[in-house]
Interface confidence: low
């Protein structure tokens, strides 16, 4: 290729090129100058650049760099944002279906427990949704509350239907008895284990995806240092000062400059790698009781089994509770 | 045992959101995401090279700019970058990351620690024969992973957890509605031997 033309005496080439960056302003010297005030594009001879032009080049270089960085991360950012949204929605759908299954189980198998059961189930699954989204709720408390609420209804509707409409005092006694007598056997503990493990993993999975977005957003909107701006200006624009419009930076030189500008960002690399590998490990383990889809969609069956367990032991329980909550019942009959 | 109800499927259409492919499950979608993320595992270390390859750089030209002058692309001067007497590249690296980058690194360290803590230990319940016996409440061992709900008679103590329901209720329309005898292909995302 022929060597580029020397800078023209009138700085015409440089001026017409610079006008594209900064229309209207007469910052380009009429003729090449010594350029002793320049800080970045230190000339070996006369130059067609001024201090003001240098500053504009630095600003443009940093903007270019930010745009390049954003386009570099666009695919990755879209991947995580899209998946975070899809999974969040999918998890909400799973919760909704799990609630529907559970409600249908009550409707089909224990119609006398509705609509109270619907209300308790609704509250439970609302808490599940909130927990997944990061609310500070204790899963054990959620499960306990579900069974505490269900038992008085089961007792008064299924085990002892002769009782008048339940009053608050017997309900409180029954709630207490529920735990003391382990009326549902080990089912509440089982559900606590399965639900807490699966929801913890789901929650951390969503948290991790959202942090992934935050990482990309952070590096996406980095403001590059003045030093970096100067290096970029030297690489991309200082050649213009000599009228060398068509030449491109040397490849090795570009890599050195970018590594300098990206030194801070590249420090994320180690933790980013670990993030992806740790996320992979988590995902590989998201099965059995660590898979909320599996656990929640099967919950109706376990709750059904727990009620059957109560019914199986109804005779023994009714006697024991009769004694335990006798005081409450007497007050209720008055 | 309780069965999948048929009268409360109000979400069938919206349910398909989680299915890009017709038989896709949440579990396969997660694995697909990880595979795609893994292609970005070197994203940050590769950034300098990526940006150079996406900005104007001399590739086929004989001459290139080294920051000070026009040089032959394969000469010693092309690699040297004329930064002497200006700002030291080493100093630039020694400054350390921006506060905002340090902050995000701390968050990554934290989430990585959480992810490692939460990761399920491998191979704990394999290669044991499934042996089950009825048990009373309180009979479920210290390891709650080993307890699953039975389908009626109390619960089961299971030495090997062997089930996995990897469906987002997708094939409920065909498979799980009671009394349905349609001809259909069984979904392989049913329960499976290892995942309960």
């Amino acid at each position: 290729q022929p060597p580029p033309p020397p800078p023209d005496a009138t700085c015409h080439q440089v001026r017409s090129f610079f006008q594209r960056l900064q229309p209207g302003l007469k910052w380009v010297p009429e003729t090449p100058v010594p350029g002793s005030d320049l800080q970045v594009c230190l000339p070996k001879g006369p130059t067609c650049c001024s201090r003001k032009m240098e500053e504009k080049y630095q600003l443009t270089a940093r903007l270019n760099m930010e745009q390049l960085l954003q386009s570099a991360s666009m695919e990755l950012k879209f991947l995580i944002i899209q998946n975070a949204a899809v999974f969040q929605e999918a998890f909400e759908i799973v919760v909704r279906h799990a609630k529907n299954y559970t409600n249908a189980m009550f409707k089909n198998n224990y119609p006398s427990l509705t609509p109270q059961a619907f209300e308790f189930v609704g509250e439970f699954f609302t808490d599940v949704s909130l927990y997944i989204l990061g609310s500070d709720i204790n899963v054990d408390d959620m499960v306990n509350e579900l069974f505490d609420s269900l038992f008085p209804v089961i007792y008064t509707q299924l085990m002892n239907p002769g009782l008048p409409d339940s009053a608050l005092d017997i309900n409180e006694c029954l709630r207490g008895a529920r735990r003391d007598l382990k009326v549902f056997g080990n089912f509440p503990k089982l559900i606590m284990t399965q639900v807490s493990k699966s929801l913890q993993v789901t929650r951390i999975f969503l948290q991790a995806l959202n942090l992934g977005i935050e990482v990309i957003n952070t590096t996406d909107h980095l403001k590059f240092s003045k030093d970096c701006g100067r290096m970029l200006t030297r690489m991309w624009y200082c050649s213009y000062c000599q009228g060398l419009m068509m030449v491109k930076p040397c490849g090795g030189y570009c890599n050195v400059v970018m590594q300098g500008c990206m030194a801070g960002v590249v420090e994320i690399d180690k933790y980013w790698r670990e993030y992806i590998l740790s996320l992979e490990e988590l995902v590989n383990g998201m099965y059995r009781i660590y898979d909320m889809e599996n656990v929640l969609l099967g919950l109706f069956s376990t709750i059904h089994d727990s009620i059957q367990y109560v019914q199986k032991n109804a005779g023994k329980l009714t006697t024991t509770i009769g004694k335990l909550c006798a005081h409450s019942q007497q007050r209720q009959y008055r | 045992s309780a069965y999948y109800p048929e009268d409360l499927f109000i979400d069938k259409k919206v349910l398909k959101v989680a299915h890009v492919e017709h038989e896709e499950t949440l579990s396969s979608r997660r694995r697909e995401l990880i595979q795609k993320l893994k292609s970005f595992i070197s994203f940050y270390s590769a950034l300098p090279g990526y940006i150079c390859s996406h900005s104007p750089v001399a590739e086929n030209d004989t001459l290139c700019w080294n920051g000070q002058e026009l040089v032959e692309r394969y000469s010693q001067k092309a690699a040297r970058n004329g930064m002497k007497n200006q700002f030291n590249l080493h100093e630039l690296k020694m400054k350390g990351p921006e506060p905002v980058v340090s902050q995000i690194i701390d968050k990554l360290k934290h989430i990585n620690q959480l992810l490692r803590t939460m990761s399920v230990p491998k191979g704990r319940v394999l290669d044991k024969n499934l042996d089950e016996e009825g048990f009373e409440s309180g009979d479920c061992g210290d390891d709650e992973d080993e307890c699953i709900g039975g389908s009626g008679d109390g619960m089961m103590k299971v030495k090997n957890q062997l089930r996995f329901l990897a469906e987002l209720a997708y094939d409920l329309d065909v498979d799980d509605v009671p009394g349905n005898n349609q001809q259909a292909t069984p979904k392989d995302n049913e329960i499976s031997t290892f995942h309960n």
Epitope: - | R31, G123, D188, N189, S192
Partner: antibody, heavy 115, light 112 residues
Framework: EVQLVQSGAEVKKPGASVKVSCKAS????????MHWVRQAPGQGLEWMGA????????AYNQRFKGRVTITADKSTSTAYMELSSLRSEDTAVYYC????????WGQGTLVTVSA | DIVMTQTPLSLPVITGEPASISCRSS???????????LQWYLQKPGQSPQLLIY???NRFSGVPDRFSGSGSGTDFTLKISRVEAEDVGVYYC?????????FGQGTKLEIK
């Protein structure tokens, strides 16, 4: 189309080992368990074990008391079943089958054990 | 291990007549997710087994509608409404809920 293609027939001496392969195609190998079932001449079907290629998890029929090892190579979408300390009663056709319901089976591999 | 018991072991049938095979499991095959994991297979002479019915009553694609499955818990039945010559072979029931998975001894269907 899902296909499972097994390795050819083998003749082995008692005490030796045999390794049967099953190459899968037409689906994502890592996503589905591969099971192994055998059938002695004129006899019924007997489940031997399974592997989940994605996680490497395995499950075995304890009747084989550690003689069977099932592995999978994700890069070639191939599952393997190795049976060691062969005896004459191990003479059978060995099938691989994809879970769930074994809707897809290999063509079978005849393993003959004789002195 | 769960024992799967099939009856009869041999079933001579006249073409066009119905046939019925029974399968009993030593334990309930109902899983806690509500599904019952019982399958029926047909193994034609010299071939690999082929799936007919999964989850008690669901016909696999391509299986003629003369085949139907029924039952619950521990007792299951495979019915062929009108036997055809191509239906000869050994029929197996199988459970895939407890490891080790097990099969019935097989029922040999032959044309009289």
């Amino acid at each position: 189309e899902v296909q499972l293609v097994q390795s050819g027939a083998e003749v082995k001496k008692p005490g030796a080992s045999v390794k049967v392969s099953c190459k899968a195609s037409g689906y994502t190998f890592s996503d589905y368990e591969m099971h192994w079932v055998r059938q002695a001449p004129g006899q019924g079907l007997e489940w031997m074990g399974a592997i989940h290629p994605g996680s490497g998890d395995t499950a075995y029929n304890q009747r084989f008391k550690g003689r069977v090892t099932i592995t999978a190579d994700k890069s070639t979408s191939t599952a393997y079943m190795e049976l060691s300390s062969l005896r004459s009663e191990d003479t059978a056709v060995y099938y691989c089958a994809r879970f769930y319901s074994y809707a897809y089976w290999g063509q079978g591999t005849l393993v003959t054990v004789s002195a | 291990d769960i024992v799967m018991t099939q009856t009869p072991l041999s079933l001579p049938v006249i073409t066009g007549e119905p046939a019925s095979i029974s399968c009993r499991s030593s334990q309930s095959l109902v899983h806690s997710n509500g599904n019952t994991y019982l399958q029926w297979y047909l193994q034609k002479p010299g071939q690999s087994p082929q799936l007919l019915i999964y989850k008690v009553s669901n016909r696999f694609s391509g299986v003629p509608d003369r085949f139907s499955g029924s039952g619950s818990g521990t007792d299951f039945t495979l019915k062929i409404s009108r036997v055809e010559a191509e239906d000869v072979g050994v029929y197996y029931c199988s459970q895939s809920i407890y490891v080790p998975y097990t099969f019935g001894q097989g029922t040999k269907l032959e044309i009289k």
